[in-house]
């Protein structure tokens, strides 16, 4: 009876279990009744980081100096290259695909501390009663407009991203 499932580090093909290729190698040909799986090492600047049946290795990430990137850790046949930013610059994401001088704070957040040469911008959520409707690297959260001081009433409540909307008070008719 042909197998319906295979052991760990194997895969099912043509009703038989074949060995997966180890990390750093790609699949050349599936096993047969008479032969083992054939695998080949990844080439220079290529990698595969799992037991696999891939027919092509992945290209190492390129740390583009035009984007402010440099190599933090050179890739191997089993690992991708890790990029980082030039000194004084900050990665825009965990994957570090581009660099910014300093982070900006999104709407709903204000700048707690402006970036310096050694530390990035520190953002903080706008508390109740304050808002920020912009991305900024220097603006703090702004207080909601006080409708009462303008002899107006709140027509629309504020949020962490929007100011309150003030309007005239309803006059009671006699």
């Amino acid at each position: 009876e042909p197998p319906t499932a295979c052991r760990e580090k194997q895969y099912l093909i043509n009703s038989q279990c074949c060995s997966l290729c180890q990390p750093g190698q790609k699949l050349v040909s599936d096993c047969t009744e008479f032969t083992e799986t054939e695998c080949l090492p990844c080439g220079e600047s290529e990698f595969l980081d799992t037991w696999n049946r891939e027919t092509h290795c992945h290209q190492h990430k390129y740390c583009d100096p035009n984007l402010g990137l440099r190599v933090q850790q050179k890739g191997t046949s089993e690992t991708d290259t890790i990029c980082t930013c030039e000194e004084g610059w900050h990665c825009t994401s965990e994957a570090c695909e581009s660099c910014v001088l300093h982070r900006s704070c999104s709407p709903g957040f204000g700048v707690k501390q402006i970036a310096t040469g050694v530390s990035d911008t520190i953002c903080e959520p706008c508390p109740v009663g304050f808002f920020s409707n912009v991305s900024s690297a220097f603006e703090k959260c702004h207080p909601w407009t006080s409708c009462e001081t303008k002899d107006l009433v709140v027509q629309q409540a504020g949020t962490n991203k929007t100011d309150v909307v003030c309007g005239p008070q309803d006059r009671l008719r006699a």
């Epitope: 984007l67 581009s98 001088l101 300093h102 912009v134 690297a137 220097f138 603006e139």
Partner: nanobody, 116 residues
Framework: EVQLLESGGGLVQPGGSLRLSCAAS???????EMWWVRQAPGKGLERVS?????????YYADSVKGRFTISRDNSKNTLYLQMNSLRAEDTAVYYC?????????WGQGTLVTVSS
């Protein structure tokens, strides 16, 4: 393609004044917070001044407060930095930058030298 072209730098004596300009293109200038950042010889980048998109709110580093004034003309897509009472420690290459400060979106800068 974002382009920022700084100009107005030069050699000036201590106590003198200069006005830097930054001509912006390749993006909607009026939508972006803009900054002036400087780099003194052998030093890191220092954030000097910033202005919000409408030109109504500004930031100044303590080292330039009361001496420098940032402004913008959204109809001309231009950012300015008026620098008065210049000191030797203001000597640097001055760059303008737009949020979110991508490395590849920086200009060449303009050199300001304060010396007698």
């Amino acid at each position: 393609e974002v382009q920022l072209l700084e100009s107005g730098g030069g050699l000036v004596q201590p106590g003198g004044s200069l006005r830097l300009s930054c001509a912006a293109s390749g993006f909607t200038f009026r939508d972006y917070e803009m900054w002036w950042v400087r780099q003194a010889p052998g030093k890191g980048l220092e954030r000097v001044s910033a202005i919000n998109p409408q030109g109504t709110r500004t930031y100044y580093a303590d080292s330039v407060k009361g001496r420098f004034t940032i402004s913008r003309d959204n109809s001309k897509n231009t950012l300015y930095l008026q620098m008065n009472s210049l000191r030797a420690e203001d000597t640097a290459v001055y760059y303008c930058a737009k949020l979110p400060f991508f490395f590849q979106e920086w200009g060449q800068g303009t050199l300001v030298t304060v010396s007698s």
